[in-house]
């Protein structure tokens, strides 16, 4: 069980990174002059609390910017949205924190992450570029809800 | 109006089981985390353990572990403590109650009125 | 196991400000022990303060707040009313269970 968030990049199988503008991630073309946002990653530690077989539950931050992912309903649709967090507070809780979890699941080099709050939505990005992450009941079709991570350092 | 219900005092012998329920109302039991509490006179209370009723994954306190058994049934709202083996020390009030976060916490916001569990024979 | 110590009674003032403290056996008090302050009033009438060391639950009134204080969790009343006379319990976290103190008996007169 690590005890130190992991920093990854995340790109979609468009070659999409995911970019931090006015406090909301939206995926863009890599570029040149994109600063992609380093994302931290972080084991539930009571993982054995949780759903088996759904992947490994997992809490999303953005390095270095006390900003984690989480996900709450807005009228009766769950949203994704950005909160301010210590990454290491959540980590540490007494009880899994479901609102700020998703279950990483990975299939050769693709990744899903899946709301623990809200099962059967993923984190998604349009296929339109330079779209909002969103979260969708709907995989492969107007979303794409496969990622690729590489860790870093 | 968020209100969790205890079921009534028991008596019951020495070496008998009783099970023991905490029925919510105001919010879903698959939304949070219900907790048990042990409050015996002039002891404070005691951590029994937790239940997540939405995966039945219940954690308990090693004092209380295999006297203890956590359950929940979600179609009805209600959470449960099942006590075994039963002596004269578990004689005590029993509470159930939600450990829910908000924001940026978790607490044990709402509490039952207790059950009062008398083992005599 | 650890065990959580409580001032056993304590009396305050109406409008004063009092402060209840909560330590710990095992070392210092620590943001990570996760301090929970509940209210005990007659006929086993629990509710929820304070969580997370220093968070106050929703419609809790603000003149309850949690903190560190030196070693110790404090819960401070600050302009005690009446209707706070209670047993106070404060529970600790220890990584994979809860510790209550015994209570601390306020008194407001």
């Known amino acids: 069980k690590s005890e130190m968030p992991q920093p990854v990049s995340i790109q979609d199988i468009n070659h999409r990174v995911w970019v931090l503008q006015d406090q909301i991630l939206i995926a863009v073309p890599r570029k040149d002059r994109v600063s992609p946002v380093t994302i931290s990653l972080i084991s539930c530690r009571h993982v054995e609390t949780l759903e088996k077989d759904r992947g490994n539950p997992i809490y999303l931050g953005l390095n270095g910017l006390n900003l984690c992912l989480m996900c709450a309903k807005a009228g009766d649709q769950p949203t994704l949205q950005l909160k301010e967090k210590d990454i290491m507070d959540l980590y540490n809780q007494p009880e899994p924190v479901k609102s700020f979890l998703f279950y990483h699941s990975q299939s050769g080099r693709n990744s899903t992450f899946e709301s623990v709050a809200f099962p059967g939505w993923f984190i998604a990005v349009s296929s339109e570029g330079g779209c909002p992450l969103i979260l969708t009941q709907e995989l492969g079709k107007a979303n794409t809800t496969d990622f690729g991570l590489t860790m870093l350092f | 109006e968020v209100q969790l219900q205890q079921s009534g005092a028991e008596l019951v012998k020495p070496g008998a089981s009783v099970k023991l329920s905490c029925t919510v109302s105001g919010f879903n039991i698959k939304d949070t985390y219900m907790y048990w509490v042990k409050q015996r006179p002039e002891q404070g209370l005691e951590w029994i353990g937790r239940i997540d009723p939405a995966n039945g994954y219940a954690k308990y306190d090693p004092k209380f572990q295999g006297k203890a058994t956590l359950t929940a049934d979600t179609s009805s709202n209600t959470a449960y403590l099942q006590l075994s083996s039963l002596t004269s020390e578990d004689t005590a009030v029993y509470f159930c109650a939600r450990f829910h976060w908000y924001d940026s916490a978790f607490y044990f916001d709402f509490w039952g009125q207790g059950t009062t569990l008398t083992v005599s024979s | 196991q650890a065990v959580v110590t409580q001032e056993s009674a304590l009396t305050t003032s109406p409008g004063e400000t009092v402060t209840l403290t909560c330590r710990s056996s095992?070392?210092?008090?620590?943001?990570?022990?996760?301090a929970n302050w509940v209210q005990e009033k007659p006929d086993h009438l629990f509710t929820g303060l304070i969580g997370?060391?220093?968070n106050r639950a929703p419609g809790v009134p603000a003149r309850f707040s949690g903190s560190l204080i030196g070693d110790k969790a404090a819960l401070t009343i600050t302009g005690a009313q009446t209707e706070d006379e209670a047993i106070y319990f404060c529970g600790l976290w220890y990584s994979n269970h809860w510790v209550f103190g015994g209570g601390t008996k306020l008194t407001v007169l």
């Open positions: 095992s070392g210092a008090v620590t943001t990570s022990n996760y």
């Open positions: 997370g060391t220093n």
